[in-house]
């Protein structure tokens, strides 16, 4: 089975760890695919190690473990993320995470501070 946090949030400009945990008494993991909606983020293979899709190579760092660290988040990164575990002989298992990217607290506080700052 796949165990994951179904909903996570992070700040714009920050980073987030995407993590799925697979447990089985019999099946061994051969490959893990990570996708943003339908777009490939990265793949881990027991044989080949990690490959980060060129589109995300400047923002996605493999790990920790079989998860991903997604950096320099933008509001457009809000959405569904999927981990797909290819196992042998168990087959394929999928997990889903919904990531909400929020406006950074600096931006929110900065606007408030600017509005209340004393003149002169």
């Amino acid at each position: 089975t796949i165990d994951t946090k179904r909903n996570i949030s992070a700040e714009e400009g920050g980073s987030v760890i995407l993590q799925c945990h697979f447990s089985s008494d019999t099946a061994e993991v051969t490959q893990v695919d990570w996708k943003q909606q339908d777009q490939l983020l990265a793949i881990y293979s027991v044989d080949l190690g990690w490959h980060v899709a060129s589109v995300f190579s400047d923002r996605v760092v493999p790990g920790p473990s079989l998860g991903l660290t997604f950096q320099s988040l933008t509001m457009n990164d809000t959405g569904e993320y999927f981990c797909t575990y290819h196992t042998y002989p168990g087959g394929i298992y999928k997990g889903r995470i919904f990531l909400k990217v929020q406006e950074s607290s600096d931006d929110r506080n900065g606007l408030a501070q600017f509005q209340t700052a004393p003149l002169g």
Epitope: Q39, L40, L48
Partner: antibody, heavy 118, light 107 residues
């Protein structure tokens, strides 16, 4: 430098057999899934067979199932395609290709021509 | 089996033109879509993998987009060496299937 070199093609009569080889170098052969793809003269690309690295799982196109056998010898860094009961419609250039992550074919050999004719 | 339909089957264009080739799958294939270039007498060459990722060493004028069933290969400014035949290929499930090809010719 990654290199894939096919050999074993030639002229064979209908019903005959051939064994194609693909010698790999420049990468860890045993870590990669591999495929055979063919191209009939003046036609498009047609996948023939694949063999996975991690599980050894083998898949064939319906058009060759029961007649062709894909195999690999990791100690020799070589991929094979045993072709039996050959038909005129098997005439094509046969390419071997490396398939990282069972996803895309990133390196191809130069191809070897198989002609089935009486 | 998943059918891959490419259009157009051929096109004529001039150096510097923006060229768009489309590929449609008979069912959803997520982003399991790759694009190859083939020149006469040569082996295919990988251009784009996973629908939108540029293969190492491929010029940035090539780009891919799409997901599900509809995909596009774009050449932003056609160069003399780009005249070739282009194929899409799905790796979502076996049998792996290719589109029929798009031949890009000189106008």
């Amino acid at each position: 430098e990654v290199q894939l070199l096919e050999s074993g093609g030639g002229l064979v009569q209908p019903g005959g057999s051939l064994r194609l080889s693909c010698a790999a170098s420049g990468f860890t052969f045993s870590s990669y899934s591999m495929s055979w793809v063919r191209q009939a003269p003046g036609k498009g690309l047609e996948w023939v067979a694949s063999i996975k690295s991690s599980t050894g799982t083998i898949s064939y196109a319906d058009s060759v199932k029961g007649r062709f056998t894909i195999s690999r010898d990791n100690s020799k860094n070589t991929l094979y395609l045993q072709m039996n009961s050959l038909r005129a419609e098997d005439t094509a250039v046969y390419y071997c290709a490396r398939v990282p992550y069972d996803y895309w074919m990133d390196y191809w050999g130069q191809g070897t021509l198989v002609t089935v004719s009486s | 089996d998943i059918q891959m339909t490419q259009s157009p089957s051929s096109l004529s264009a001039s150096v510097g033109d923006r060229v768009t080739i489309t590929c449609r799958a008979s069912q959803s294939i997520s982003s399991y879509l790759n694009w190859y270039q083939q020149k006469p007498g040569k082996a295919p060459k990988l251009l784009i993998y996973a629908a939108s990722s540029l293969q190492s060493g491929v010029p940035s004028r090539f780009s891919g987009s799409g997901s599900g069933t509809d995909f596009t290969l774009t050449i932003s400014s056609l160069q003399p060496e780009d005249f070739a035949t282009y194929y899409c290929q799905q790796s979502y499930s076996t049998p792996l299937t290719f589109g029929g090809g798009t031949k890009v010719e000189i106008k």
